[in-house]
């Protein structure tokens, strides 16, 4: 039962997780499929239950070790199947020859914390979790501040190029409310893509103090 | 638009040869895997090879592998697959269908073409 598009994407977080999405339009809801994992220079292999995360998409998670474990390198390809049941058989509906450190996905940053805040300035620290010593200092991050009567989406990107796991936030408001996120991206593979943003970490500005402009 | 046509099936008896081929257009076929899938009749599509868009990685189902063989050519737009020692059950249609990258593919009707017949019988 399957008919149209179909898609099959997986990223490595660059220690010990491979997370997978399937998607099929007309595949069957209530089809046990799950994907398989294969090093080509590897002992081990590795299999996820798919689970489904929408009316025509799947995801798992491949844990391949210890979080901060280092399971695979730049020279690793792992063969990637998805393997459906149908009757008493399992079925291949998709393969990858799945490069690593092609396709990176780092875990969000995460112990966000304000170092100093000021009237008009925030310090704000993070670090990176799960990430590769293999990286180096070759990362680069995004952040945004929520500020109020915005959305997230309204919130311009702020750009680290380089790895620096703090900014000074600038130009704030006195007595203020605001939010912060931070996303973290290696700058190798070609199909690396950013992390998921950070938990947001609230923060108030100090007020003004009073006699005095601002 | 993507445009797949098989050739190369036919009649042939238990443990004997065909070379099936799927000329490609409407898109830089070497930046895409390839894979060759097969529907019995009364069953469901199986997969049967894949390779990948530069023919350095190749893979095949369990009920095929040492007999079939996969292969390519990008200058000529062309995927092959080499049929050997063939056996009744492999009779079935022939499909081949374009891969997602040049490292995957996902089983899709939208990127299939109509298909090739090979029947194996005595």
């Known amino acids: 039962a399957v008919n149209g598009t179909s898609q099959f994407t997986c990223f490595y977080n660059s220690r010990a997780n491979i997370s997978c999405v399937w998607s099929q339009d007309g595949a069957l809801q209530d089809t046990s499929c799950q994907v398989h994992a294969w090093p080509d220079r590897r002992r081990w292999n590795q299999t996820c239950e798919l689970l489904p995360v929408s009316q025509a998409s799947w995801a798992c998670n491949l844990i391949l070790g210890a979080p901060d474990s280092q399971k695979l390198t730049t020279v690793d390809i792992v063969t990637l199947r998805v393997l459906c049941r149908e009757g008493v058989r399992w079925r291949v509906m998709a393969i990858q020859d799945f490069k690593p450190f092609e396709n990176l996905r780092l875990m969000a940053p995460i112990s966000l914390q304000v170092v100093h805040v000021e009237t008009h300035r925030c310090n704000i620290s993070w670090e990176i979790s799960q990430a590769s010593h293999y990286f180096e200092r070759h990362l680069e991050f995004e952040a945004r501040t929520l500020s109020p009567g915005h959305t997230w989406e309204e919130a311009p990107l702020l750009t680290l190029k380089q790895k620096q796991e703090w900014i000074c936030l600038e130009t704030l408001t006195p007595d203020t409310q605001y939010e912060f996120q931070v996303r973290v991206k290696p700058l190798q593979g070609e199909f690396t893509t950013w992390s998921p943003w950070s938990q947001p970490l609230a923060f108030r500005t100090k007020p003004a103090a009073l006699g005095k402009d601002t | 638009q993507v445009q797949l046509q098989e050739s190369g099936g036919g009649l042939v008896q238990p443990g004997g040869s065909l070379k099936l081929s799927c000329a490609a257009s409407g898109f830089r076929f070497s930046n895409y895997g390839m894979s060759w899938v097969r529907q019995a009749p009364g069953e469901g599509l199986e997969w049967v090879s894949y390779?990948?868009?530069?023919?350095?990685?190749?893979h095949y189902a369990d009920s095929v592998k040492g007999r079939f063989t996969i292969s390519r050519d990008n200058a000529k737009n062309t995927l092959y697959l080499q049929l050997n020692s063939l056996k009744t059950e492999d009779t079935a249609m022939y499909y081949c269908?374009?891969?997602?990258?040049?490292?995957?593919?996902?089983?899709?009707?939208?990127?299939r073409g109509q298909g090739t017949q090979v029947t194996v019988s005595s």
């Open positions: 390779i990948n868009g530069d023919g350095s990685r190749t």
């Open positions: 269908e374009k891969g997602l990258s040049r490292d995957g593919w996902s089983l899709s009707a939208a990127s």
